[in-house]
Every structure is written in structure tokens, then in C-alpha cells.
């Protein structure tokens, strides 16, 4: 197993609709054809898997139907979007990239993107 550099933004603010997007870029040392991308969340001394997708280079990123993540790939960049976020989901979101095929296997872990989620204030009652 070999190490690989992965870059991602330090901070992202989710939209009022609970959507956060960020780019995960990896320095591919070779010509990988099969790549696995995993989004992890670190909070309260625990790391949990948010979502994961395996894709063939040049093809679309496909997450499971019930996943809160969507994404697209372009070269060595993956554009990730996480939906349905609430204030309690604020945390450090880490991009993990694995070059699965062909060998050798490479593993890269980003420094994490701190995603801040602010629940929208409910609209006040209106006379109109």
C-alpha cells in the first residue's frame, strides 16, 4: 500500500437548505482506472462513514440510491455534494481516496473539510 496526497478545502458553509459541496482532489501517481471515494465524518472522537462510491475513470460517480451524497468526477478531481444536513451534522468531513486498480493500491486521506450547518430560523407568523 502506498500513500497519496489528497487536497480538500478547510471550511465550507452549508446552504440554508442543508446542502454542502466541496472538491476533493488527489495526486494520482499513476493511471488508475478504478477509484473509490469515501466521505468520513469525524466528531466527538468518532469517525463514521457518510457515503462511498467506486467509479471507473471517465465514468460518473454513482452512490447508492439512499445516499445523502452525490458527485461528479473530472480527471483527478471529485466534486462532492452532501444533502439533508442539519446543525447537528456540523463536523469535519474527510475525503478518503483509494486507487483500487490497477496495482499498486494507493490510499490518500485529506485533512478534512469543516462543514458548518446552521438550521434556518422558522419564519415568523404573518398577517398577510
Amino acid at each position: 500500500c502506498k500513500a497519496m496526497h489528497v487536497a480538500q478545502p478547510a471550511v465550507v458553509l452549508a446552504s440554508s437548505r442543508g446542502i454542502a459541496s466541496f472538491v476533493c482532489e488527489y495526486a494520482s501517481p499513476g493511471k488508475a482506472t478504478e477509484v473509490r471515494v469515501t466521505v468520513l465524518r469525524q466528531a466527538d472522537s468518532q469517525v463514521t462513514e457518510v457515503c462511498a462510491a467506486t467509479y471507473m475513470m471517465g465514468n460518473e460517480l454513482t452512490f447508492l440510491d439512499d445516499s445523502i451524497c452525490t458527485g461528479t468526477s473530472s480527471g483527478n478531481q471529485v466534486n462532492l455534494t452532501i444533502q439533508g444536513l442539519r446543525a447537528m451534522d456540523t463536523g469535519l468531513y474527510i475525503c478518503k481516496v483509494e486507487l483500487m486498480y490497477p496495482p499498486p493500491y494507493y490510499l490518500g486521506i485529506g485533512n478534512g473539510t469543516q462543514i458548518y450547518v446552521i438550521d434556518p430560523e422558522p419564519c415568523p407568523d404573518s398577517d398577510f
Epitope: C1, A3, L40, Q42, S45, Q46, V47, T48, L92, I94, L107, I109, G110, N111, G112
Partner: nanobody, 126 residues
Framework: EVQLVESGGGLVQPGGSLRLSCEAS????????IGWFRQAPGKEREEVSC????????NYADSVKGRFTISRDNSKNTVILQMNSLRAEDTGVYYC???????????????????WGQGTQVTVSS
């Protein structure tokens, strides 16, 4: 709240083997840096081995190199310390320790640890 629980200690003859397990209750050890320390009677506690959060890096004290092997089993939420060719000087209480580092350090062992188990006694004697 995560707690570490060691098991697998016991009495073994010189040259024998033991397999120590460090298991997390109340959480997972995924991507945690885990270390094993030991304390012999009348001696200071010393680090025996550690494994990084990714499992790619392992370190060993000179006194156990080639005899001890540390590994992760994330499916069982445990870290194993396989101890072979045990000697009398390996006797002591063995402690599992853990720390979840920043992701930039997941490929390294921790310099210090937040969490300690209660320890398991290992006695090597004929």
C-alpha cells in the same frame, strides 16, 4: 463515551505465545491511533508497540521487535497484539491506549494518548 477493554493475558511458559486484544465499548476504533504499553513490577511504564489510524504504520520497542506483531481488525472493532517467543522480562501489566488524531496524522502513531484501558496481566514463568 468510548472505553478500552484489554483481554488475553495470562500465565505462559518462556518461549510461549499470547494474543492480547483491545476492544472498544461505546464506540469504534476506526482511524484511532492505538498503542500498547506495559509496566513491569518496580519499573516505569513503557510503550511496546503502536499502530496508526490507517494501519499503514506500526512501531515496536527494540526489546520486542521480531517477536510482537500489532494489527487492526476493524470488522471486530479490535486491535491485536500477537506476542511470540515470550521471555520472563515480558512479564507485566499490558495496557491498551488510544487517541483519535486529526486526519492529517492518521498515518502516524500518537505521541500521547487520551484513553487508557484497565490493563491485563501477562506473566512469563516456568
Amino acid at each position: 463515551e468510548v472505553q478500552l477493554v484489554e483481554s488475553g493475558g495470562g500465565l505462559v511458559q518462556p518461549g510461549g505465545s499470547l494474543r492480547l486484544s483491545c476492544e472498544a465499548s461505546g464506540g469504534t476504533l476506526d482511524y484511532w491511533s492505538i498503542g500498547w504499553f506495559r509496566q513491569a513490577p518496580g519499573k516505569e511504564r513503557e510503550e511496546v508497540s503502536c499502530i496508526s489510524g490507517t494501519g499503514l504504520r506500526t512501531n515496536y520497542a527494540d526489546s520486542v521487535k521480531g517477536r510482537f506483531t500489532i494489527s487492526r481488525d476493524n470488522s471486530k472493532n479490535t486491535v491485536i497484539l500477537q506476542m511470540n517467543s515470550l521471555r520472563a522480562e515480558d512479564t507485566g501489566v499490558y495496557y491498551c491506549t488510544g487517541k483519535l488524531l486529526h486526519p492529517s496524522l492518521w498515518s502516524a502513531c500518537a505521541n500521547e494518548y487520551d484513553l487508557w484501558g484497565q490493563g491485563t496481566q501477562v506473566t512469563v514463568s516456568s
